[in-house]
Amino acid sequence: EPPTACREKQYLINSQCCSLCQPGQKLVSDCTEFTETECLPCGESEFLDTWNRETHCHQHKYCDPNLGLRVQQKGTSETDTICTCEEGWHCTSEACESCVLHRSCSPGFGVKQIATGVSDTICEPCPVGFFSNVSSAFEKCHPWTSCETKDLVVQQAGTNKTDVVCGPQDRLR
């Protein structure tokens, strides 16, 4: 009876279990009743990082100097290239696909510490009573407007991203 499931590092094809190709190799042909799976090493600047049945290897990431990137760790047949930013610049994400001089803080966050040559911008969430409605690399959270000091009342509550809205007090007739 043909198998319905295979062991680890195998895959099911044509009602039989074939060995997966090891990391660093791609699939050339599936196994048969009489032959093993045929695999080939990835070429220069290519990789596969898992046991696989891929027919094409992945291209190593290119660390584009026009985006401020440089190679932190050269890729192998089993690992991708790791990029980092030029000195004084910062990755925009964990994957480090581009660089910025310094990060900005999103709405709802204020700048706790402005970036320096060695450290990136440090953001902090705006606490209750404060807001930031912009992306910024220097602005702190701003305090909500005090309606009372203007002899007004709060018409709309503030949030971490919006100021309160003040309006006139209801006059007693």
């Epitope: 026009n66 985006l67 401020g68 925009t92 581009s98 660089c99 910025v100 001089l101 310094h102 990060r103 900005s104 912009v134 992306s135 910024s136 690399a137 220097f138 602005e139």
Partner: nanobody
Framework: EVQLLESGGGLVQPGGSLRLSCAAS???????EMWWVRQAPGKGLERVS?????????YYADSVKGRFTISRDNSKNTLYLQMNSLRAEDTAVYYC?????????WGQGTLVTVSS
């Protein structure tokens, strides 16, 4: 395509003044926080001054506080840096930059040399 073109640099004596301009195109200038950043010979980038999109909030590095003034004219898509009481240590290439400060968000720079 973002374009930032700085001008106004030059040679000036200590104690003198200069006004730098940065003409912006290729993006909606009024929507962006803008910065002046400088690089002295053989040194890293130094953040000099910043201004929010509406010109209501500004930032100055301690080294230029009280001497430099940042401003913007959103109707002309232009950023300015008025530099007074210039010192030898202000000698640098001055760049204007926009959020989010990627490699594309920079001008070519204008050289300011303070020397007697």
């Amino acid at each position: 395509e973002v374009q930032l073109l700085e001008s106004g640099g030059g040679l000036v004596q200590p104690g003198g003044s200069l006004r730098l301009s940065c003409a912006a195109s290729g993006f909606t200038f009024r929507d962006y926080e803008m910065w002046w950043v400088r690089q002295a010979p053989g040194k890293g980038l130094e953040r000099v001054s910043a201004i929010n999109p509406w010109g209501s909030h500004t930032y100055y590095a301690d080294s230029v506080k009280g001497r430099f003034t940042i401003s913007r004219d959103n109707s002309k898509n232009t950023l300015y840096l008025q530099m007074n009481s210039l010192r030898a240590e202000d000698t640098a290439v001055y760049y204007c930059a926009k959020l989010p400060f990627t490699f594309d968000d920079w001008g070519q720079g204008t050289l300011v040399t303070v020397s007697s």
